[in-house]
Interface confidence: low
């Protein structure tokens, strides 16, 4: 019988709240001292009279206040994230598609387009998407290269998304960019084909714009027998989403609560 | 007497390892089903015979393998991070210093230099530094601006560090850039003055290079009575470091273990 | 850190991550998960012997804090610290699915 | 989430974050911390009533997992989830120091 065994692990006995508070307070006494590596509170004999110096208060406030661009402590996992995510992938539209024609000539950029009907098949509603990654297989790279990722915005305009500093490498390596927000936008809009641009980083005073990095799916003059591998390893979107039926189940159980 | 109370909270009874394993296994049974929102295992009646399709295996492997640029789960806090950090700040060298003279004319950039002797006073050894932030007070901004931060590298070369997309704002706002690695480098080197550059982001095909954002410490024509506030709010490095004596204590206790 | 590197190679009696491999077929009687065949779930076990008493010398307690009660809890408990996800492949009807389950593998434990 | 917004305004008996304000002078008898005068340390308390038995219907258990045993522990425990740091100002001799103490304020709890 498991019942007796159960008691060995049970901690749900009646607990005296005041005792717990007292223990917590005493634990904090030790915690603060131990974090400061002090065996006992520091002597206050030499502390100058009067208020704290302005500079010290300013420093204390800088430390206390969170500012734009500073990352907060990790957020608790939202309820929806507890449940499993279905994983799918959508390959980039192949480069012989006519959409690429007007972008072919650039030395500083490569373009990657995706069919939104395939995306919608994988993720019927934007709210279901929990993560989307753009994955690219970079081939050998002789020199360090700083690249930037852009999203196609309207007509011929591009919106900056992120950047990456690529170290030289003798072997192929997968790169991943988080594009969750962008893919969520695409799922909400009516467009048929949407895309990204990977560009060399150009600083304001430098004119060296050539994209040196070789991304699988774009290189030419390959041996025919490599074509299949090459095609399967072209850029793709890796999608993680809550399946529709689970999402509905999740909503109805949330309503029942 | 506290002793009796103590027993209410104690959980350090002898525990049957096999029972715990059995409970954990049964808990996992429920956990997997609940994460998949299944009340019972799915029927296998319609599963096609033979191995899994190649595409499914490829997708499974993509999910299983971690790739460059994908963030891992948060790392456990290293032992050294458990202990308190001393917080100090080092203000930027004032703009009337001669170091700025050769950089004054640029429309796309502003420059910020720091005295490394002040940094070394705050953090005597590079290994003690746990975090360094460059903090800038941005004033009102009428249009969205994409800015980049660079580190002065050698002679007249600059190394890209990070970027930020600044939204328009009617009120001043502190910006923070994590520059821990850079400051650690500076502490290891012999230079007297080191610096950063904040520049407008220039894409390869656009030539709009003007830095629109106004950073406190660089604007001119201020009323005299604002000078002090303005001076104190000029860019600074906020440093968090293990005090030298605590670090030594930490090392000796690590050796004793 | 109370992680697999330390705990699996030591005889630590206090809070530590303990080895546990789950074979879906053998341990759970499941044939429906096609990949993987099983996984290293692991679990946390062991007391967090936090010394608490009004008359204990603090100098003795301080060194134990980081390991045994870093969160200054009234009754510290041995729980997972670092967790990793698990992708699985299974069928719904004739359709294969790849799904990722979050926080399935215990990599390290802590007294919290 | 078992956070301050939910727990401080409810009468939840199970695992939840509980209010605890520490006044350094009154509660610890300390005058040496000059800023702040105290802080909301809070703490986690309450059972994690995970139903475990070979004959329990799984359909009944599933709904309880997320709240009461998301980590599939053999004996889930109520512990901090989100923590925040605390900066303090104190003197060493004549010299004021600002230091940041990590993981001092409990913002939410979880059964782990």
């Amino acid at each position: 019988d498991y019942k007796d065994d159960d008691d060995k692990l049970s901690t749900s006995k009646t607990i005296d709240m005041e005792l717990v508070k007292r223990k917590r307070i005493e634990a904090i006494r030790g915690q603060i001292l131990s974090k400061l590596r002090l065996a006992s509170p520091p002597s206050q004999g030499e502390v100058p009279p009067g208020p704290l110096p302005e500079a010290v208060l300013a420093l204390y406030n800088s430390t206390r206040d969170r500012v734009a661009g500073e990352s907060a402590e990790p957020e608790p996992e939202p309820e929806a994230d507890y449940y499993a995510k279905e994983v799918t992938r959508v390959l980039m539209v192949e480069t012989h598609n006519e959409i690429y024609d007007k972008f072919k000539q650039s030395t500083h950029s490569i373009y990657m387009f995706f069919n939104t009907s395939e995306l919608r098949e994988a993720v019927p509603e934007p709210v279901l998407l929990s993560r989307a990654e753009l994955r690219l297989l970079r081939l050998k790279l002789k020199v360090e290269q700083h690249v930037e990722l852009y999203q196609k915005y309207s007509n011929n305009s591009w919106r900056y998304l992120s950047n990456r500093l690529l170290a030289p490498s003798d072997s192929p390596e997968w790169l991943s960019f988080d594009v969750t927000g962008v893919v969520r936008q695409w799922l909400s809009r009516g467009g048929e084909i949407e895309g990204f641009r990977l560009s060399a980083h150009c600083s304001c005073d430098s004119r060296d714009n050539t994209l040196q990095v070789d991304i699988n799916g774009f290189t030419t003059g390959r041996r025919g027998d490599l074509a299949t591998i090459h095609g399967m390893n072209r850029p793709f979107l890796l999608l993680m989403a809550t399946p529709l039926e689970r999402a509905q189940h999740l909503q109805s159980s949330r309503h029942r609560r | 007497d506290y002793k009796d109370d103590d027993d209410k909270l104690s959980t350090s009874k002898t525990i049957d390892m096999e029972l715990v394993k059995r409970k954990r296994i049964e808990a996992i049974r429920g956990q997997i089903l609940s994460k998949l929102r299944l009340a019972s295992p799915p029927s296998q009646g319609e599963v096609p015979p033979g191995p899994l399709p190649e595409a499914v295996l490829a997708l499974y492997n993509s999910t299983r393998d971690r790739v460059a640029g994908e963030s891992a789960e948060p790392e456990p806090e290293p032992e050294a991070d458990y202990y308190a950090k001393e917080v100090t700040r080092v203000l930027m060298v004032e703009t009337h210093n001669e170091i700025y003279d050769k950089f004054k004319q640029s429309t796309h950039s502003i420059y910020m230099f720091f005295n490394t002797s002040e940094l070394r006073e705050a953090v005597p050894e590079p290994v003690l530094l746990s975090r360094a932030e460059l903090r800038l007070l941005r004033l009102k901004l009428k249009v969205e601006q994409h800015v980049e931060l660079y580190q002065k590298y050698s002679n007249n070369s600059w190394r890209y560090l990070s970027n930020r997309l600044l939204a328009p704002s009617d009120s001043p706002e502190w910006l923070s850039f994590d520059v821990t690695g850079v400051v650690r480098q500076w502490l290891s080197r012999g230079g007297e003055i080191e610096g950063f550059r904040l520049s407008a982001h220039c894409s390869c095909d656009s030539r709009d290079n003007t830095l629109q954002v106004d950073i406190n410490g660089f604007t001119t024509g201020r009323r005299g009575d604002l000078a002090t506030i303005h001076g104190m709010n000029r860019p600074f490095l906020l440093l968090m470091a293990t005090p030298l004596e605590r670090a030594q204590h930490l090392q000796s206790s690590r050796h004793r273990r | 850190a109370l992680d697999t590197n330390y705990c699996f190679s030591s005889t630590e009696k206090n809070c530590c991550v303990r080895q546990l491999y789950i074979d879906f077929r053998k341990d759970l009687g499941w044939k429906w998960i096609h990949e993987p065949k099983g996984y290293h779930a692991n679990f946390c076990l062991g007391p967090c012997p936090y010394i608490w008493s009004l008359d204990t010398q603090y100098s003795k307690v301080l060194a134990l804090y980081n390991q045994h009660n870093p969160g200054a809890s009234a009754a510290p408990c041995c729980v997972p610290q670092a967790l990793e996800p698990l992708p699985i492949v299974y069928y719904v009807g004739r359709k294969p699915k790849v799904e990722q389950l979050s926080n399935m593998i215990v990599r390290s434990c802590k007294c919290s | 989430a078992l956070d301050t917004n939910y727990c401080f305004s409810s009468t939840e008996k199970n695992c939840c974050v509980r209010q605890l304000y520490i006044d350094f002078r009154k509660d610890l008898g300390w005058k040496w911390i000059h800023e702040p005068k105290g802080y909301h340390a809070n703490f986690c308390l309450g059972p994690c009533p995970y139903i475990w038995s070979l004959d329990t219907q799984y359909s009944k258990v599933l709904a309880l997992y997320n709240q009461h045993n998301p980590g599939a522990s053999a004996a889930p425990c109520c512990v901090p989830q989100a923590l925040e740091p605390l900066p303090i100002v104190y003197y060493v001799g004549r010299k004021p120091k600002v230091e940041q103490l990590s993981n001092m304020i409990v913002r939410s709890c979880k059964c782990s």
Epitope: R64 | D170, S171 | - | T4, Y21, D23, P36, H40
Partner: antibody, heavy 122, light 108 residues
């Protein structure tokens, strides 16, 4: 059960003084920041001031000369001393518990008493 | 002191209507802004703090937005129990606590 009960209101002549009390129960009073707010008949809310756990007070500019806030933690009681009263001080006076979950924002009124009416009239 | 200017001072609406009340601060207060509801003969009740955080137990039809100087309280679908007076409040520090003059929501 958190409770705040104001008392000490009533009719008072112009130029005289009055002391209002606010009795707190159901929570750890000495750990909480407390506020006084008033509301003239048919008008909006006016913040008078606040007292922190340590006894530090903040008051609105208009209240600084004549109004004093104090507390007695041993009695779980908050006080508002009003001097040189005028007809325009006629109002319902509320005490309210501060909400200090974010560090320094003690001025969100999380829990209010029912109020006590002060009428200044000759 | 910071002045909080609320508009409109009163409005008439029907059950089911979407109602919006705005509040303007005389200087930037970041998101240190709260909204209260008051019914006749009762003390005010906290609805929203930090400009957009819903107080526990407040129905989700209430929402708040804004930062800096401009703030909005929205009731997505007015219910019979929502007819009351609403006040905004700034609380960025002890020298800038102030209430708006109130907005009375009446039955049309």
């Amino acid at each position: 059960q958190v409770q705040l009960v104001e008392s000490g209101g009533g009719v008072v002549q112009p130029g005289r003084s009055l002391r209002l009390s606010c009795a707190a129960s159901g929570f750890h009073f000495s750990n909480e920041a407390m506020n006084w707010i008033r509301q003239p008949p048919g008008k909006g809310l006016e913040w008078i001031g606040y007292i922190y756990t340590s006894g530090t007070t903040y008051r609105s500019n208009w209240a600084r000369g004549r109004f004093t806030i104090s507390r007695d933690n041993s009695k779980n009681t908050l006080y508002l001393q009003m001097n040189s009263l005028r007809a325009e001080d006629t109002a319902v006076y509320y005490c309210a518990r501060g909400w200090h979950i974010f560090g320094h924002q003690y001025w969100v009124m999380h829990f209010w008493g029912q109020g006590t009416l002060v009428t200044v009239s000759s | 002191d910071i002045q909080m200017t609320q508009s409109p001072s009163s409005l008439s609406a029907s059950v089911g209507d979407r109602v919006t009340i705005t509040c303007q601060a005389s200087q930037s207060i970041s998101t240190y802004e709260a909204w209260y509801q008051q019914k006749p003969g009762q003390p005010p009740k906290l609805l929203i703090y930090a400009a957009s955080t819903l107080e526990s137990g407040v129905p989700s039809r209430f929402s708040g937005s804004g930062s800096g100087t401009d703030f909005t309280l929205t009731i997505s679908s007015l219910q019979p129990e929502d007819f009351a007076t609403y006040y905004c409040q700034s609380y960025s520090d002890g020298d800038s606590v102030g209430f708006g003059q109130g907005t009375k929501v009446e039955i049309k």
